[in-house]
C-alpha cells in the first residue's frame, strides 16, 4: 500500500521536495502520505535549529505555522 516511489535518500537528509503539497513524508514508513486532517497549509521545511518536539495537539487546536515554528505537532494522524 505504498504510494509510489517518492522517498528520502537518507533518513535524516531530505531530498528536494519529495512530496506533493498535500502530502508529508512519514519517516516510519519512508514514503509520502496524506498530511491528513490538518486545517492549515503544510508548513515550510524547518530551519537548522529547531525546538524540542512537543506533545501532539488535539485536532481542534491551531496547527498554524508561525514565524518560529519548526516542530509542529500533528494530532497523531496517519
Amino acid at each position: 500500500m505504498r504510494r509510489g516511489p517518492r522517498s528520502l535518500r537518507g533518513r535524516d537528509a531530505p531530498a528536494p521536495t519529495p512530496c506533493v503539497p498535500a502530502e508529508c513524508f512519514d519517516l516510519l514508513v519512508r514514503h509520502c502520505v496524506a498530511c491528513g486532517l490538518l486545517r492549515t497549509p503544510r508548513p515550510k521545511p524547518a530551519g537548522a535549529s529547531s525546538p524540542a518536539p512537543r506533545t501532539a495537539l488535539q485536532p481542534q487546536e491551531s496547527v498554524g505555522a508561525g514565524a518560529g515554528e519548526a516542530a509542529l505537532p500533528l494530532p497523531g494522524l496517519l
Partner: antibody, heavy 126, light 107 residues
C-alpha cells in the same frame, strides 16, 4: 478521559478465528493511527499491526502477515483485529494503542504509542 | 528488523537509589527510541519519547539520553511505585520492535 477499551478475547482452537475490538473515547479517534501489540506469557512485547487514520495504509508483523487483518470504523470510534488461522503461538495478551506522531516541517516523526487499552487475553488451545 | 538489546534483564535496588537501564540497537536509529513502564497485569505506559523527551504527566525523576545505537533510561531517585518492568522501543522503521525488558525489583 482519553480511553481505549478492549473486548473480544477468549479461548479458541487452532485454525479458528477471533475478532478483537478496541473502542476509543475522549479523543478524535478518526485523526489517529492505531496499533495492535501483543505479549505472550512471560515474553517480550511484539508489534502486530498498524493502521492509518483513514485506512490508507496498513502494515503487519511477519508472524501474522496473511492471517490477521487490522481495520477500523471511524463512525463507531472502534479499531478491530480479525485473527484467522490461529496458532498456539498466537496465545498472548493483545493491546490496542494510539500512534504518537509529530510534524516537523513536512516530515512526520513517530514517537511510539502514547495511549494503550487494558489488554485482552487470547488463548489458542485444542 | 532492528533488534533492541536491553541490559540488565533484571536488577535489585532500594528506594532512593539511582537506576540506569541501557538499550542498544542493532543499527543506528537516530533518536527514535521510546521507553515504557509496565506493571504486572497492566498495559505499558509511555515514559520517554524521542530518546529524551518526557511524556506529559511523567515524573521528572525519569530521564532518557542517547542517539544512534546506545540509549539510557535513568531514574534519579527510585520510588516505591517505580518497581516495574521497563521496555525500550524503536520507532525508526517498520516493523516496530521492543527490547525484552528490564525488571526493577526491590532489594
Amino acid at each position: 478521559e482519553v480511553q481505549l477499551v478492549q473486548s473480544g478475547g477468549g479461548v479458541v482452537q487452532p485454525g479458528r478465528s477471533l475478532r478483537l475490538s478496541c473502542a476509543a473515547s475522549g479523543f478524535a479517534f478518526s485523526s489517529y493511527g492505531m496499533h495492535w501489540v501483543r505479549q505472550a506469557p512471560g515474553k517480550c512485547l511484539e508489534w502486530v499491526a498498524v493502521i492509518w487514520y483513514d485506512e490508507s495504509n496498513k502494515y503487519y508483523g511477519d508472524s501474522v502477515k496473511g492471517r490477521f487483518t487490522i481495520s477500523r470504523d471511524n463512525s463507531r470510534n472502534t479499531l478491530y483485529l480479525q485473527m484467522n488461522s490461529l496458532r498456539d503461538e498466537d496465545t498472548a495478551v493483545y493491546y490496542c494503542a494510539r500512534r504518537f506522531t509529530n510534524l516537523r516541517g513536512w516530515i512526520i516523526e513517530d514517537y511510539g504509542l502514547d495511549v494503550w487499552g487494558q489488554g485482552t487475553t487470547v488463548t489458542v488451545s485444542s | 528488523e532492528i533488534v533492541l538489546t536491553q541490559s540488565p534483564s533484571s536488577l535489585s535496588a532500594s528506594v532512593g537509589d539511582r537506576v540506569t537501564i541501557t538499550c542498544r540497537a542493532s543499527q543506528s536509529i537516530s533518536s527514535y527510541l521510546n521507553w515504557y513502564q509496565q506493571k504486572p497485569g497492566k498495559a505499558p505506559k509511555l515514559l520517554i519519547y524521542a530518546a529524551s523527551s518526557l511524556q506529559s504527566g511523567v515524573p521528572s525523576r525519569f530521564s532518557g539520553s542517547g542517539s544512534g545505537t546506545d540509549f539510557t533510561l535513568t531514574i534519579s531517585s527510585l520510588q516505591p511505585e517505580d518497581f516495574a518492568t521497563y521496555y525500550c522501543q524503536q520507532s525508526y522503521s517498520i516493523p516496530l520492535t521492543f527490547g525484552c525488558g528490564t525488571k526493577v525489583e526491590i532489594k
